[in-house]
Interface confidence: low
Amino acid sequence: SQVSQNCHNGSYEISVLMMDNSAFAEPLENVEDAVNEGLEIVRGRLQNAGLNVTVNASFMYSDGLIHNSGDCRSSTCEGLDLLRKISNAKRMGCVLMGPSCTYSTFQMYLDTELSYPMISAGSFGLSCDYKETLTRLMSPARKLTYFLVNFWKTNDLPFKTYSWSTSYVYKNGTESEDCFWYLNALEASVSYFSHELSFKLVLRQDKEFQDILMDHNRKSNVIVMCGDPEFLYKLKGDRAVAEDIVIILVDLFNDQYFEDNVTAPDYMKNVLVLTQSPGNSLLNSSFSRNLSPTKRDFALAYLNGILLFGHMLKTFLENGENITTPKFAHAFRNLTFEGYDGPVTLDDWGDVDSTMVLLYTSVDTKKYKVLLTYDTHVNQTNPVDMSPTFTWKNSKLPNDITDRGPQ
């Protein structure tokens, strides 16, 4: 049976899937607030452009009867249940916002023919790459692998004079949704990261990780992990660490490093933190009042999803083009739109580009300092601190393999 799209005659709707399983354990009220704030901005922008149209959101709630674990790993069917709800109601907006879980998104793509665009705050996994009508507004795993490979190969910076080709990856299976898929992409034999490295080993047990820190026979000095400093401390504690160990802590969606008066704990001295620069204006936003530093990015992605919808609506209406066409469904990519916190760029496959930031702990000030930034759009590393006050010898990052002997 055909589902009619509420997407014509001056009335345009975005369907927002409100799933119990989401990439971040964020109360649905906060997501609703973000969507509503976005709608207000969109209405204003359309009005300013002389487009007298109605824009609304319809929230589709999962009843939680079948899938109520609140865990993305069990979310495969929930997205399909919600799609069936849409099908039964025979009503759909111009755009579908959600789901955020990789399994849900992947399954929805397998089991449905999506003739409308889908915007996701999440869907981090490689299995959601290259989907023609999917737009992802939080950095997917593919972008992380590009950064890591780029950084591993870099050998022409004052603080990094060795190319790296090896790594350990710590992955114990208890990670958050974003970390789970980021680490999966590093672990997978099919991934860019795996294929550019000559050695990579996944450490799955706490003891394996702890042993490597002082193992003279270790195959790499570099360990990639994902989580926040507290997660690292629970694992590493105050254990001694060999002087040429480098831990890369992936913590993309955490603004805490940039907050005033933050001091880096001692156990972070051997650690480089990969994160993203925060959006200052979001901190004062009405809907962010209840958001922790790690949740702002998720809420912002929902808000930006609404703004993207508004941007595409404006573009198509100004050009006199039909909204319910395959052209519209495939248009949410290769563009820049005005997001809540400044311009947002989407790549050729509809994935958000961002500036990743690599931080180190200054041994002088015990503060987090920016070592370099990385622009995912142009795959380029830009050094920021040419004379970092590192813990490592000669204030340079060590070789990834100790005592290689004559090269």
Epitope: Y103, F106, Q107, L126, S127, Y130, A188, S189, V190, H195
Partner: antibody, heavy 122, light 110 residues
């Protein structure tokens, strides 16, 4: 039509060396990883190693690392397997094959050469 | 390396029979909801030919009588109705971590 054609096989004495070639045609050579797989008479398939033609990155199975080297010549659209210190147990048909990665992230050998026989015997 | 063990090692069957070959991995070959396991057919003097990829997806040009199933560590190749041209050796292969093959299952005419 995508084609892989191996050459360079033959009879070689134990301790000797041999260089096998794999000429690729019908596709963009630098876009696909190239692999070498061998099969001893009456036995199963054994992966030797792989090379990324675009940048020459190689991964060779531990078992062969000290004796076998994989290389490419992009100008000739060819991959090579240099085999040194050959032993009787290296007697096998050697195949080159490429991997394709689908957009869903699946990775497998989709095209194979016809194979070339290497016999190590005195 | 991930070890793959096929059973049986050899099998006699007749045209029209339904045949099942199994492949067991020493550890899971699953990755984001799919299994990185392939099945190949090889005839004497010929190179292997891809039949099934990702455990259950039929390769281009392969007859629908071939099907694959399984996940994690246990996989099955089924030929629903044997044809004369199906008598060959079948190999499973994983691409989850590097590349390894099963030892092969030789399918012979009864």
């Amino acid at each position: 039509e995508v084609q892989l054609v191996e050459s360079g096989g033959g009879l070689v004495q134990p301790g000797g060396s041999l260089r096998l070639s794999c000429a690729a045609s019908g596709y963009t050579f630098t876009s696909y990883w190239m692999h070498w797989v061998r099969q001893a008479p009456g036995k199963g398939l054994e992966w030797i190693g792989e090379i990324k033609p675009s940048n020459g990155l190689t991964n060779v199975h531990e078992k062969f690392k000290n004796r076998f080297t994989i290389s490419v010549d992009k100008a000739k659209n060819s991959a090579y397997l240099q085999m040194n210190s050959l032993r009787a147990e290296d007697t096998a048909v050697y195949y080159c094959t490429r991997t394709i990665t689908t957009t869903e992230g699946y990775w497998f050998f989709d095209v194979w050469g016809q194979g070339t026989l290497v016999t190590v015997s005195s | 390396d991930i070890q793959l063990t096929q059973s049986p090692s050899s099998l006699s069957a007749s045209v029209g029979d339904r045949v099942t070959i199994t492949c067991r991995a020493s550890e899971s070959v699953d990755y984001y909801g799919s299994s990185l396991l392939q099945w190949y057919q090889q005839k004497p003097g010929k190179a292997p030919k891809l039949l099934i990829y990702a455990a259950s997806k039929l390769a281009s040009g392969v007859p629908s009588r071939f099907s694959g199933s399984g996940s994690g560590t246990d996989f099955t190749l089924t030929i629903s109705s044997l044809q004369p041209e199906d008598f060959a050796t079948y190999y499973c292969q994983q691409t989850r971590k590097a590349y390894t093959f099963g030892q092969g299952t030789k399918l012979e005419i009864k």
